[in-house]
């Protein structure tokens, strides 16, 4: 067991902060939660706390949730392909460009590391060249949210992973609005990491709404879990 | 306990420029958003701007915008306001307040800031 | 940008029940603060979220609101209770905060 993995043995409070700029529409988020890296289940509650959000919350759940994967579930058998509890307490830099298909793209930057108790993941997002009355700032999206493989390898020049995976959003006539992302996470510290084999993160997540909030927000239950690489032979014969 | 403390005001001519300091203590200041609400004498209360927790976003009431400036150092606890180009309208008693998701929670005391010549 | 409308004053016996009313385009789409300034000092939250009290305000402050008015009653009001009440919301990213201009309330 990796140092940073004893952090996640129980729950853990998760506090989100994000600001972010998407074709000049300013807005900040607040999200607050808990983690149980047990089960790889996260559940979270955003509120924009600038008013309305500008583009559709499902365009921002990688962003939230897909950043804190220090909380998914690393079978037994993976523990020592877990880059992202490794890197605790200290945290790492999260990197991202997310490109979405015939509109425009995000590039976003976080540190996600424990302050006391609880993880906080905090971002900056900017956004650039969307269609006014695209899928986007048009707020085409449906309110939900499709199952994803988020592929992992180790970057070994930079003592760090590369990730890569394309998110389906649906849209309310019925098609899909692709987005590609290209993923990048460094340690904050300087102490040993785990740089794993290639291997995916599986990826469920729910989205619904909280009957009593008036005010804009998105509520996130999600579950996690590593996958891809298959015990040893050593572990056949046990 | 949590506590905000303003500095900085005081008398300046029309044109003059002002900074506006906010120490704060007794809570996590790099979780919160902050906000400078002011008050004219006798009036009532007026938002003029805020900065996110992170401090990359920042808001302004139309009547300074281009003129005042919020900044924050999360390192220092400090939240500040850069006034320039003062008016005598605006001439109040500037209060620091923290932002808890969509409102004030904690006041400060106030610093009165006077444009007259 | 909404806007909120408070009477300037109000006035209410010692031990009666005062109303301070905020009123505002479909403002009961949105929560509602209160906040009490006695002269001289900074504004104290005493309602947030259109009913909900901070720890420390007594219980015969309340809070309601629907429709286009938010309320701010203050039952067995007490001399100590003599301030100004400003009611406040929050708006677009253009304006962050949106107070109402402040309502007297004398206790005779």
């Known amino acids: 067991m990796s140092k940073g993995e004893e952090l996640f043995t129980g729950v853990v409070p998760i506090l989100v902060e994000l600001d972010g700029d998407v074709n000049g529409h300013k807005f900040s988020v607040s999200g607050e939660g808990e983690g149980d890296a047990t089960y790889g289940k996260l559940t979270l509650k955003f509120i924009c706390t600038t008013g309305k959000l500008p583009v559709p919350w499902p365009t921002l759940v990688t962003t939230f949730s897909y950043g804190v994967q220090c909380f998914s579930r690393y079978p037994d058998h993976m523990k020592q392909h877990d880059f992202f509890k490794s890197a605790m307490p200290e945290g790492y830099v999260q990197e991202r460009t997310i490109f979405f298909k015939d509109d425009g793209n995000y590039k976003t930057r976080a540190e996600v590391k424990f302050e006391g108790d609880t993880l906080v993941n905090r971002i900056e997002l900017k956004g650039i060249d969307f269609k006014e009355d695209g899928n986007i700032l048009g707020h085409k999206l449906e309110y939900n949210y499709n199952s994803h493989n988020v592929y992992i390898m180790a970057d070994k020049q930079k003592n760090g992973i590369k990730v890569n995976f394309k998110i389906r959003h649906n849209i309310e006539d019925g098609s899909v609005q692709l987005a590609d992302h290209y993923q990048q996470n460094t340690p904050i510290g300087d102490g040993p990491v785990l740089l794993p084999d290639n291997h995916y993160l599986s990826t469920q997540s729910a989205l619904s709404k909280d009957p009593n909030e008036k005010r804009d927000h998105m509520v996130l239950l999600e579950f996690v879990t590593a996958a891809g690489i298959t015990h040893g032979m050593d572990e056949l014969y046990k | 306990q949590v506590q905000l403390v303003e500095s900085g005001g005081g008398l300046v001519q029309p044109g003059g420029s002002l900074r506006l300091s906010c120490a704060a203590s007794?809570?996590?200041?790099?979780?919160?958003?902050m906000h400078w609400v002011r008050q004219a004498p006798g009036k009532g209360l007026e938002w003029v701007s805020g900065i996110s927790s992170i401090g990359s976003n920042t808001y302004y009431a139309d009547s300074v915008k281009g003129r005042f400036t919020i900044s924050r150092d999360n390192s220092k606890n400090t939240l500040y306001l850069q006034m320039n180009s003062l008016r005598a309208e605006d001439t109040a008693v500037y209060y620091c307040a923290r932002w808890y998701k969509t409102y004030i929670d904690v006041w400060g005391q106030g610093t009165l800031v006077t444009v007259s010549s | 940008d909404i806007e909120l409308t408070q009477p300037p004053s109000v006035s209410v016996a010692p031990g009666q029940t005062a109303r301070i009313s905020c009123s505002g385009d479909n403002l009961g789409k949105k929560y509602v603060y209160w906040y009490q300034q006695k002269p001289g000092q900074a504004p104290v939250l005493v309602i947030y979220g259109d009913d909900e009290r901070p720890s420390g305000i007594p219980e015969r402050f309340s809070g309601s609101n629907s429709g286009n008015t938010a309320t701010l009653t203050i039952s067995g009001t007490q001399a100590e209770d003599e301030a100004d009440y400003y009611c406040a919301s929050y708006d677009s990213s253009h304006i962050l905060i949106v107070f109402g201009g402040g309502t007297k309330l004398t206790v005779l």
């Open positions: 007794g809570f996590t200041f790099s979780r919160y958003g």
